[in-house]
């Protein structure tokens, strides 16, 4: 099938990093500078994404793959493909319309981005608070009060803090 297809369409032989050049009898020409083709059989190469201003280059463009951007220090990516950059806050804070604000009592944020989230309610799992929460850290839940009664054979190890949530990027 591949052989048949290539007889019908000479462009199918052009690998990634090249394009099928109609101006040169459909021979495979390398992608020009600052462009790429990530699949074979392309009739044009795509222009590379350019990371400038508040964006910086995380991965350089090559003839077969696009550039990737992230944000200048103090900012983090938001939106599809890092289409914008949002200011970082400190751990224990969240970004509001008025700037970075400390998490309210009973909430925490262990990242430089995203919102403050409520501490875990240990009692919902029948456990007790082993380590109190802070603005930067969730509470650590320990064994239930019943497990601590005299004669209990073992102590359940503390549950790990919840995996930090990640805002969509």
């Amino acid at each position: 099938f591949e052989r048949t297809r290539s007889l019908q369409d000479p462009c199918s032989n052009c690998p990634a990093g090249t394009f099928c050049d109609n101006n040169r009898n459909q021979i495979c020409s390398p992608c020009p500078p600052n462009s790429f083709s990530s699949a074979g059989g392309q009739r044009t190469c795509d222009i590379c994404r350019q990371c400038k201003g508040v964006f910086r280059t995380r991965k350089e463009c090559s003839s077969t793959s696009n550039a990737e951007c992230d944000c200048t220090p103090g900012f983090h990516c938001l939106g599809a493909g890092c289409s914008m950059c949002e200011q970082d806050c400190k751990q224990g804070q969240e970004l509001t319309k008025k700037g970075c604000k400390d998490c309210c009592f009973g909430t925490f944020n262990d990242q430089k981005r995203g919102i403050c989230r409520p501490w875990t309610n240990c009692s919902l799992d029948g456990k007790s608070v082993l380590v109190n929460g802070t603005k930067e850290r969730d509470v650590v839940c320990g064994p239930s009060p019943a497990d601590l009664s005299p004669g209990a054979s073992s102590v359940t190890p503390p549950a790990p803090a919840r995996e930090p949530g990640h805002s969509p990027q």
């Epitope: 044009t44 400038k52 508040v54 289409s83 970004l95």
Partner: antibody, heavy 124, light 107 residues
Amino acid sequence: QITLKESGPTLVKPTQTLTLTCTFSGFSLSTTGVGVNWIRQPPGEALEWLALIYWNDDTYYSPSLKSRLTITKDTSKNQVVLTMTNMDPVDTATYYCAHEGIIGFLGGNWFDPWGQGTLVTVSS
Amino acid sequence: DIQMTQSPSSLSASVGDRVTITCRASQSISSYLNWYQQKPGKAPKLLIYAASSLQSGVPSRFSGSGSGTDFTLTISSLQPEDFATYYCQQSYSTPPTFGQGTKVEIK
């Protein structure tokens, strides 16, 4: 509040050099991520981007006009200057400067806000 | 350069109408697409950035959608002050390029 204002001659003769100044307030061109763009619009036509200078002196030019354009900044005066050589009647347009970068807590490659624009006519 | 094509080039509509303007890029530009409004004798004003984010102070009747090559600006209920020319612009690569504009006129 960010404001920008363009200034320069309203009439230029063919072959002469145009010098335009963008004077701005409300931001500093020494702040990371910030840039100033020049964009023009011939009467009744669409917008055309010309040039850009960033806080770190990185400059970008329209490929079709690169040989004729120079963009510079004076951070202490809050000014950006665009020079365009060998002016032609087809360069008659309203010339705008526009801020790019971080407003509030968000940044990206968009133009906001723009100056009011200055109409430059090229005629002998 | 990346070409941006807007359609229609002009349209007539009445106050209260729902208006849709489309913009097509000559290659994928992800979400690096901005929309501007320009009134006669005035500078353009940013409406939408990053394809769908509403600029501060812009009425919520304006919305943007799309990614890749096809994008849309929608005005849910046209108001008298919305009669203007609208431009899309890609910020994916240099040079940034604009569409040719869509003029929204009173029917």
